[in-house]
């Protein structure tokens, strides 16, 4: 017999008080956790449930992206009576359970954060013994990953009429401001920032027409730091090629 409950409300961390001995299903997660790329972060998740002395098999699950349907990034299972939750899935080996599900704690540690980890995560617990029940966080916890700028691509490309243009793409969070400097550009030319669709942390700046030979430098900066990279344009005069 499978019995399940979902509360229509989800409480923030440490805000729920139960006066009645008959607990309801609920999950407590903070709305957001912030950490820097390369560091580790802890995603807190605690829960209450109505099965007071349940010690049967249980499964703890974390999903990314969306509740109920999103891909699992972590899963562990604990046998009847056991406090050890044996990891069955840890995406890229970077997810580790910190909490003890037997003590209503599903908190997760994420190692070696990358900007791609910046998304919403949802905890879920499943009972599968004498009691069959499950519960999942509906709103989840947003993992906000910050990062100093990094220039991921800088290039010179041909344009119509034997002209050339330069492209600079950088990533960071907050998204970095990009600026170009180079021959006849003066003291740094600020470029319009255009976050690329589907790549929220990537920004690209273009120099549409390179009129002089020489070194062109792209600088990316945000509140966490700055990064720069250069490209060289040397045209073979009398020919239509270029050396970069």
């Amino acid at each position: 017999f499978v019995r399940t409950k979902i509360d229509t409300t989800e409480n923030l961390l440490n805000t729920e008080v139960h006066s009645s001995p008959a607990q309801r299903w609920s999950m407590q997660v903070p709305p957001e956790v912030s950490a820097e790329a390369g560091d580790a972060a802890v995603l807190p998740c605690t829960f209450t449930h109505p099965h007071r002395h349940y010690d049967g098999p249980l499964t703890a699950i974390w999903r990314a992206g969306e509740p109920y349907a999103g891909p699992q990034v972590f899963r562990c299972a604990a046998a009847r009576g056991s406090e050890l939750c044996q990891t069955a899935l840890s995406l890229h080996g970077r997810f580790r359970l910190l909490g003890n599900p037997r003590r209503n704690d599903l908190s997760l540690r994420v190692e070696r954060l990358a900007l791609a980890d910046d998304r919403r995560y949802f905890c879920r617990v499943e009972f599968a013994g004498d009691v069959h029940d499950r519960y999942e966080s509906r709103h989840g916890v947003r993992l906000h990953v910050t990062a100093a700028p990094r220039i991921v691509n800088i290039s010179v490309l041909p344009s119509p009429a034997h002209a050339f243009r330069a492209l600079c793409t950088a990533e960071g969070e907050p998204p970095p401001a990009l600026a170009w400097s180079g021959p006849a550009l003066g003291n740094s030319l600020a470029a319009v920032r255009s976050p690329r669709e589907g790549h929220g942390h990537l920004v690209t700046a273009e120099l549409p027409a390179l009129t002089h030979d020489g070194r062109y430098t792209c600088t990316a900066a945000n509140s966490l730091g700055r990064s720069e990279a250069s490209v060289y344009l040397f045209r073979f005069h009398g020919a239509s090629g270029a050396s970069t």
Epitope: F1, R3, I61, Y68, R134
Partner: antibody, heavy 122, light 107 residues
């Protein structure tokens, strides 16, 4: 491509047996609970059976309990329904269906096969 | 077993109309309810899960609401391709049960 493909349906006499298969592709089969749902001609949908991702737990509708057996071979990405002691009232299109979200439970069925017709008649 | 009762059994409507189908459970099923669309000769298609979550790829004119025992599926502005039969299904407890279906026909 994510899909489910049933096979094994056909005409069988009352008391006879059939084995339905459902070949899955395009997703991590072993992570998902799988089910069989049937639909008698001109009627509504009826849940038949569910098996958890690891195959450790199986569940049946009372109308088929003791006669039908659900199983899966995760190495072959295939779900089965062994149907014995078939009755006229088992005549239906049989669909296999995947649970939404990788977990043991079927929170909903987000992927369905095209169905295979089982006719029980003498 | 939990009984699922849909109403109406059939409904006639025109393109552009707003249509609401209701589903009532015989006991509290929290939010463990899904809605499916089925066209003749085809497999059902998931529209809504966990009462109000829109399945990926399903047009936003479909929406679900409710919890406990009373649930609704709303189509905000009917399109020609929406004429079909709609089923609700509870996944609160086994045996999973479906409503008897609501046939949506062109007026």
């Amino acid at each position: 491509e994510v899909q489910l493909l049933e096979s094994g349906g056909g005409l069988v006499q009352p008391g006879g047996s059939l084995r339905l298969s459902c070949a899955a592709s395009g997703f991590t089969f072993s992570s998902y609970a799988m089910s069989w749902v049937r639909q008698a001609p001109g009627k509504g949908l009826e849940w038949v059976s569910t098996i958890w991702g690891g195959g450790g737990s199986t569940y049946y509708a009372d109308s088929v309990k003791g006669r039908f057996t659900i199983s899966r071979d995760n190495s072959k990405n295939t779900l089965y329904l062994q149907m014995n002691s078939l009755r006229a009232e088992d005549t239906a299109v049989y669909y296999c269906a995947k649970a939404i979200g990788s977990s043991w439970y079927s929170d909903a069925f987000d992927l369905w096969g095209q169905g295979t017709m089982v006719t029980v008649s003498s | 077993d939990i009984q699922m009762t849909q109403s109406p059994s059939s409904v006639s409507a025109s393109v552009g109309d707003r249509v609401t189908i209701t589903c009532r459970a015989s006991q509290d099923i929290s939010s463990w309810l899904a809605w499916y669309q089925q066209k003749p000769g085809k497999a059902p298609k998931l529209l809504i899960y966990v009462a109000s979550s829109l399945q990926s790829g399903v047009p936003s004119r479909f929406s679900g609401s409710g919890s406990g025992t009373d649930f609704t599926l709303t189509i905000s502005s009917l399109q020609p391709e929406d004429f079909a039969t709609y089923y609700c299904q509870q996944s609160y407890s086994i045996p999973y049960t479906f409503g008897q279906g609501t046939k949506l026909e062109i007026k």
